[in-house]
């Protein structure tokens, strides 16, 4: 499978909410012994490999934000820790995987990465990730609502081993 990032750039005004999205493409094994681990984290530009560095999102680590579910299931973070930080990650039946960030501040600007791992009965088999940028703006130049910029098809379907 691949991970696509429908949008490579999100430009949002301070105080707004935003939902960053990744999408699983291609055949997804839904066998009973196959599960998926999905998470989000921050990273930085200028590395040899995008998303190799991992930073927390609002002090929450990739493990705090992770989802783990079967190939045929939907899931979302229900724990208080994420919600207290204005965060919620979710995954639906159609391969969409997202993180919602509420009440954005300038400190939320940066590079965000989603990670999806296919696990076949205890064994981590495939690891793929996607990257996107969030710019939070303030002042008269800021948009009134979030503006999203589509990825080029080449970028959005790029597979990168994490």
């Amino acid at each position: 499978f691949k991970v696509a990032t429908p949008y490579s750039l999100y430009v949002c005004p301070e105080g707004q909410n935003v939902t960053l999205t990744c999408r699983l493409l291609g055949p997804v094994d839904k066998g009973h012994d196959v599960t998926f681990y999905k998470t989000w984290y921050r990273s930085s530009r200028g590395e040899v490999q995008t998303c190799s560095e991992r930073r927390p999102i609002r002090n929450l680590t990739f493990q705090d934000l992770h989802l783990h579910h079967g190939g045929h299931q939907a899931a979302n973070t229900s724990h208080d820790l994420a919600q207290r930080h204005g965060l919620e990650s979710a995954s639906d039946h159609h391969g969409n995987f997202s993180i919602t960030m509420r009440n954005l501040t300038l400190l939320d600007s940066g590079l965000y990465c989603c990670l999806v791992v296919e696990i076949r009965h205890h064994h981590s088999e495939h690891r793929v990730h996607g990257a996107m940028e969030l710019q939070v703006q303030t002042g008269k130049d800021a948009p009134s609502n979030c503006v999203v910029y589509p990825s080029s098809s080449q970028d959005s379907e790029n597979i990168t081993a994490a």
Epitope: Q63, I119, S124
Partner: antibody, heavy 121, light 106 residues
């Protein structure tokens, strides 16, 4: 906080059976495998098998088929391992361990405190 | 069955020394996990997927390897590191542990 609490030590007669319990708290018990591990002095750690509480699905180390039987009760978040036809070779500390998926890698992330089973006439 | 052979069985080191223990697999593996066990206690998850430290593990520990050969290294041993270290594979049933390396501090 995840915790696995095992039942207390057992002194058993040869030929008898024993049932060890492992109560889980702090996570979704039904969704993660419970592993069972044997440790005899000087013998290291030996994987016996596993159960997925939500479905009741089990996998056994061939060596322990017929010796160990796993069950789980999702209403009490408790997993059980029964050992039958006990011999002195079954004298050991038995651990339950909870599968944790960390960074997309499953491993034995949570361990019970161990249950000592002694088989003696 | 994949057999994991750990060496040495016993390792004696002085505080501040660098030590390395190895784990060899009878078949090639994608990665290896390591656990630490102290006498009278349950094993603790220590290093996952060959080289990643579990939460709370001191940075003096590191792991490396690929294929059939893996190792755990402590850059500067401390007294609290005295324990037995086990490697473990979760690639094929039966899932197996190595025989352990007991680290003694002089």
């Amino acid at each position: 906080q995840v915790q696995l609490q095992q039942s207390g030590a057992e002194l058993m007669k040869p030929g008898a059976s024993v049932k060890i319990s492992c109560k889980a708290t702090g996570y979704t018990f039904s969704r993660y495998w419970i592993e069972w591990v044997k440790q005899r002095p000087g013998h290291g750690l030996e994987w016996i098998g596993e159960i997925l509480p939500g479905s009741g699905s089990t996998n056994y180390n061939e060596k322990f088929k017929g010796k160990a039987t796993f069950t789980a009760d999702t209403s009490s978040n408790t997993a059980y391992m029964q050992l039958s036809s006990l011999t002195s070779e079954d004298s050991a500390v038995y651990y339950c361990a909870g599968e944790e998926v960390y960074d997309g890698y499953p491993w034995f992330g949570y361990w019970g405190q161990g249950t000592l089973v002694t088989v003696s006439a | 069955q994949i057999v994991l052979s750990q060496s040495p069985a016993i390792l004696s080191a002085s505080p501040g020394e660098k030590v390395t223990m190895t784990c060899r697999a009878s078949s090639s593996l994608s990665y290896m996990h390591w656990y630490q066990q102290k006498p009278g206690s349950s094993p603790k998850p220590w290093i996952y997927a060959t080289s990643n430290l579990a939460s709370g593990v001191p940075a003096r520990f590191s792991g490396s390897g690929s294929g059939t050969s893996y190792s755990l290294t402590i850059s500067r041993v401390e007294a609290e590191d005295a324990a037995t270290y086990y490697c473990q594979q979760w690639s094929s049933n039966p899932y197996t542990f190595g025989g352990g390396t007991k680290l003694e501090i002089k």
